[in-house]
Structures are given as C-alpha cells and as structure tokens.
Interface confidence: low
C-alpha cells in the first residue's frame, strides 16, 4: 500500500573540524521510494556539486572536506507524492583549532610610554588568549591588560617590563603558541648622584662625582662654566647600566661644573644635567650690594622644568626666598591650567626660569636672565593668544600685588644670546632643531611683531627631553 514518507532518524547537530568529513543521515520510510533533496541555509544543494556526496538514495549527505564557510542549517526534504513532503533539519558547527593570525613582533619602547603587542587569533570555539613572560604566565594588573582582541597592552612601561613574551591561544580543540618576541625598554638618561658643591682654598684638588643611568647606558660629559672641561682628569666606570664619572680638578678659580648624561633613542637623544659650584673660600666674602644667593633648586613646583639640582638665584628681598618664590610659581601655575597644550609647556618653562633664574656664582652671585630669543619664541610662537590676555591682565592690575614678579617679562629688554651667549639663559624645553621649530603651529595667524631668530639646536639631531608638565 502507498505510504507517505516518514523521517525515522531526524537530523542532528553535527560538529566537524576544518578539512574533515561531515555526514548527515536522513532515514526515510515510505512507499513508493521518495525523492530526497538537501538544502543548506534554504539553498538547494545540487547533486553534481563535487564538494558533496549524496548516497543511499539521497538519505546520506557527506561534506567531503569541511570548510569554515560550511557552517549553517542543513535540511532534507522527502516527497513521494503520497501525503505531503516531510522535512528534518540539523546544524553543522565547524570547529577550528586555535590559529594565531597576527603574531606579536619585537618592540623597542621608551619607559613611561604605552606598548601594544598584537596577538590576533581565530578558532571555534573562540580561543582565549593569555600571555607568557619568560617562563611564567603574565598576570594582569592596573597597567597590564589583555585586550578583547588578544593584544597585550602595557601602560606606562617600566624597566621591569622588558623581557621575552609569547601569546597562547587556547580552545577545547587545542593550543597555539606564538613565536617568542622581545620587549626592550629604553630609559631616558637620569642622574643618580649629582656632583656636590665645594668651598675650597685656592690650589686645592677636588674630585667631582657624577653617576647616571639609562637604557642604553648614557655617556657623561663635563662642562665648566658653559664650555667643555679644558683641564682635569676624568675617570669612568660602567656597571649594571650605571655609569660613574669622576672629574678631578686643580682649583685656581671658582666655577660652575655641570655633569651631562646623554643617551640615544633611535634618532633622538635624552639628556640629564646636574651642576655643582666650586667656590674659593677667600672669594666669598658677602658684599653689601648682594641681593641674593645661589642655591640648588630644592622646590617642587618647577621640578619637571628646571634641571635636577639646578643652581638658581634666590632673592633675599624676601624673608624666606625659597618659600616665597615657590609660592609665586605655585599661584601662577594655576593660571596655566587653562592655556593650550602647545603653550603650556613653553609658558611653564618661561615661568620657572623667570622666577627661579639661573644663578652665576661669583664674587657677587648674579641671576642670569632668559635670552630674548627664547622669550620671543614663547610670546610670538607658542603662546601668542595667551600672552595678549596675560599682558591685558597685568596692565589692568588683575594680578594680586604679590604677583608683581609675574608680570610677563618684557622680551625686548632681555639680552640677546647673539650679543654674549653666556649673559643669558636658554630654555632647554624650547631647544627644538630649526626644522621642528619651523613646523610648530603658531597660535595666531597674525605675523609676529618681532622677527624671531632661529633657535640654535645643540646638535643637528639632539633634543632636550621635556618631562611631564603637571602640578600633580
């Protein structure tokens, strides 16, 4: 008797690995024998499609080599003209072992910046990604995170982050490892031990000691009163990324000796400076017209702007010069919170060097004013708009009386470095090379009222490292 088709083994979900065989079975009872057709995602599978094999009168569908794109819903439909057609459906889930499609690469980065090591993966189920540093699993913390993409992000890179890394992609079907890559952390030159000032008798021997560190290990040069040291012997040793330099001097005159540590990062250099004064005992008799004294800057607000242990002029017209000048900067610093990111570092450098002027230690300690060219660079180039506002406030008396020092310097009254390079102080933060300075975006479209001479670069490829400019 004729019998309508009945599917006796409904299709089930089939899991298959890529490149393996996957088979769906659709057993049908009917009379006469039915015609069985197959669809994938409601699209008919053609009998002559060579990727499939259809056997047992259509009851077996075999995918000969599973691909990623074979994922989907497969249905068999049986019809023999008796009763209605019947259908059964099942899913094919293509499983895939983890595969790293974008492996990490070697990275060289400066301490304090952000590093990202890529690790993009594919697989089904979606692989989980973890990282190994050296021989141990890497633990995430507030600085170190594995991103959704699998990449490793390290904020504020530290020296101890340097090492060998590899990423591991894992799912229920297996594990994939990337090749080992190296994260190298470079560190700006930093002075660990600054030379100490000495008050000695004429003809004494003095050894100045300067220790610096950085990655790569910095070189140390000594400067005497602004020039390369012409006499004295220098001994150096390097151990554990620390360079130790000793300058032995025979003292016949007072002087300011600066230790400069320099290291290279790609095409750029970073420098750190520390200075010591050598004074001769008989020369330091106080004089009536002495309006201040030289001392190492021990304050806080200008730490990021002035060289560490910079020798600054402290004005004795204040009862407590150090605290009074510090308070002046502190109060003014707050004004700078509202200026543009282009202006702010330049203004901070100008402010700190204006209030804590570089000091020339001699018979009479003398403040060294800022060079006119640097003042003009801040006024006309970096802070044109802001400068107008400041001048307006100063003229209208909007600054409180104790802020008299903060009336913006009159650039035209400052000495030019072209007259006497030692008579005025530079702002190292503005010592870009000429190319950088030319491309720096001015804050105004109007033409500067004074021609700004090109600022000299210390060497064709060097620059001065600007630390973070922030009250906190």
């Amino acid at each position: 008797l004729p019998k309508a088709p009945v599917i006796t083994t409904p299709l089930e979900t089939v899991d298959a690995l890529v490149e393996e065989v996957a088979t769906f079975m659709c057993a049908v009872e009917s009379y006469p024998q039915p015609e069985i057709s197959w669809t994938r995602n409601k699209i008919l599978i053609k009998l002559f499609d060579t990727r499939y094999s259809i056997r047992e009168n259509g009851q077996l569908l075999t995918i000969l080599s599973v691909e990623d794109s074979d994922d989907g819903i497969y249905c068999c439909t049986a019809n023999n003209g008796v009763g209605g057609a019947v259908e059964s459906c099942g899913a094919l889930q293509v499983k895939m072992k983890p595969k790293i499609t974008r492996p990490p690469i070697n990275v060289k980065i400066i301490e304090g910046l952000k590093a990202v090591l890529p690790c993009t993966t594919m697989g089904n189920p979606k692989p989980s990604v973890s990282w190994i540093k050296g021989d141990s699993p890497l633990r995430e913390n507030s600085r170190i995170a594995v991103l959704e993409s699998g990449s490793l992000r390290i904020h504020n890179v530290q020296k101890e982050d340097a090492g060998q890394y590899r990423c591991v992609a894992k799912n229920s079907l297996g594990t994939a490892y990337s090749k080992v890559v190296k994260l190298e952390v470079e560190v700006f030159a930093r002075i660990l031990r600054a030379p100490e000032s000495h008050n000695v008798t004429f003809g004494s021997f003095v050894t100045l000691h300067c220790t610096a560190t950085g990655i790569p290990v910095p070189t140390i040069t000594w400067i005497e009163n602004g020039n390369a040291v012409s006499s004295g012997s220098i001994q150096e040793s390097v151990k554990d990324r620390v360079i130790d330099s000793r300058l032995q001097l025979f003292i016949t005159k007072p002087g300011l000796y600066t230790c400069i540590a320099t290291n290279k990062h790609g095409e750029k250099f970073s420098t750190a400076k520390a200075a010591a004064t050598i004074s001769i005992a008989e020369w330091s008799k106080p004089q009536k017209d002495n309006k201040g004294y030289c001392a190492q800057y021990r304050g806080e607000v200008c730490n990021a702007v002035l060289a560490k242990d910079a020798l600054v002029f402290l004005n004795t017209s204040y009862a407590d010069p150090e605290e009074a000048q510090e308070l002046l900067v502190h109060t003014a610093w707050n004004e700078l919170k509202v200026v543009s990111p282009v202006c702010r570092p330049a203004a901070e450098a100008l402010l700190c060097n204006h209030i804590f002027q570089e000091c020339s230690p001699g018979v009479v300690p003398t403040p060294i004013p800022i060079c006119r060219e640097y003042c003009l660079a801040v006024k006309e180039l970096f802070c044109a708009k802001e400068w107008l506002v400041m001048e307006e406030k100063t003229h209208r008396g909007l600054y409180r009386s104790e802020m008299h020092l903060l009336s913006v310097p009159e650039c035209s009254k400052l000495p030019s470095m072209h007259w006497d390079p030692t008579a005025c102080a530079r702002l190292p933060h503005l010592d870009y090379n000429k190319e950088n300075l030319k491309t720096f975006p001015p804050m105004t479209s109007s033409k500067p009222s004074v021609d700004i001479p090109n600022l000299p670069s210390s060497s064709s490829s060097s620059f001065s490292v600007s630390p973070t400019y922030s009250m906190t």
Partner: antibody, heavy 121, light 112 residues
C-alpha cells in the same frame, strides 16, 4: 608590579615610639613624592605627612608636628615615619601612599595595604 | 584649620547618576586646591579616582568625572553600578602659611 608594603606597626604604650617603614617596588622610587595617611578604626582618612622626591622638604599635619618625622632612603627605596611621644588618638591604620609626581602634594595614586598602630596602656 | 565638608551619605539606583560634593567650611574650593577624589571599599586600602579637579587616574572607568561646581568640588558617577558602593573621600591641597593636605569626612554611597 607597583607595590608599597608597610611594616613596623604594633601595640605601644602612650609616650612610646615606633618607626614605620614602607618598602617600594615596581616603580622609580626616587622620582615620586610620598605621603603617610592614617585611618582610625571606623573613621575617615587623615593626612599625616608628605615628602617630595628628593627629601628636600617635609610637611606635617599640625597635631603631629614635633612628634613625627618623615624621611626617605632613595637608595633603599624605602619611606619612613618615626613616631615619638605617641598618644591614644594616634591609634590608626597607617597607609604609605605614592604621589603622582615629584612634588610632596601631588595626588595619591598608589597605596599600601596599611599597618595598624595601637597606642594603649 | 579649615574643615573639608562632604555629605555623610548618599544613595543612587543602579544605572542612575549621583553627585558627591566637597566644600570648605570657610571659603570656596578652587582649582588651586587641586581637588582629588578617592574610593575605599570595606577592608581595602583607598584607591585614587580623580586628581587635580577633573583628571582620571589610569584604569578608572569613564563613568567617574570630576569638576568644580559653584564653590565646591564635585564627583559625578553616571550610570552607577553595584560595585560603586563604597566610601568616597575628597582631598584638598591647602596653603595658609604652610602647605597642607586635608581629607573630607567621607561620603558613604549606597547603590540601592
């Protein structure tokens, strides 16, 4: 990993002394200001003392001036708080905290787990 | 000695917005006080949230924001979550003859 680990707390009689230490690791210690902050049981936070990166100056809460001394040894990456003439109101958990820059009064961006100081007879 | 004032307690519904304030018993809070905000959950050390009025510490979710509103510093939590239930302290830098740092009494925030 940045870590601040306080030690030296304990039970002491009124008028006695204690020296707290804070061992720092995972960051360049000599580039940051540091502070001590305390918290009496069930009470709020109270700033005690601060010191900039170079130890060039020190700052104290009025009630501890002359009794407490903050200091640092950058070579040992350690911050100290010498507490003399202790009073019962000094009982608290003492936290060592890192400032976010070189200055003594930057924001506190990392804290230790604290060490308990109990002043009682 | 100036006293730093905060609301003793506040509550917010999950997903809601709440503003905590930090004032001075005498005078106004300005950006010269560099207001900082800290969060402390029971049994834990405090953690920095906001520094210098409105800058977020790294790792702090963007739902926390700081500002100065009127004569007070303010911490706003937009889209509060259950894990935001904690004590919140503000800290102010003071300068009156000598430098000082003062915490407020703290605000107990409950996420209902």
């Amino acid at each position: 990993e940045l870590q601040l680990v306080e030690s030296g707390g304990g039970l002491v009689q009124p008028g006695g002394s204690l020296r707290l230490s804070c061992a720092a690791s995972g960051f360049t210690f000599d580039d940051y200001g540091m502070s001590w902050v305390r918290q009496a049981p069930g009470k709020g936070l109270e700033w005690v003392s601060a010191i900039p990166w170079n130890g060039g100056s020190t700052y104290y809460k009025e009630s501890v001036k002359g009794r407490f001394t903050i200091s640092r040894d950058n070579a040992k990456k350690t911050l100290y708080l010498q507490m003399n003439s202790l009073k019962s109101e000094d009982t608290a958990v003492y936290y060592c905290a890192k400032r976010s820059g070189r200055i003594a009064f930057g924001a506190l961006d990392a804290w230790g787990q604290g060490t308990l100081v109990t002043v009682s007879s | 000695q100036a006293v730093v004032t905060q609301e003793p307690s506040l509550s917010v519904s999950p997903g809601g917005t709440v503003t905590l304030t930090c004032g001075l018993s005498s005078g106004s809070v300005t950006s010269s006080n560099y207001p900082d905000w800290y969060q402390q959950t029971p049994g834990q050390a405090p953690r920095g949230l906001i520094y210098s009025t409105d800058s977020r510490h790294s790792g702090v979710p963007s739902r926390f924001s700081g500002s100065i509103s009127g004569n007070k510093a303010a911490l706003t939590i937009t889209g509060a979550q259950s894990e935001d239930e904690a004590d919140y302290y503000c800290g102010l830098y003071m300068y009156s003859g000598s430098k000082n740092y003062v915490f407020g009494g703290g605000t107990k925030l409950t996420v209902l």
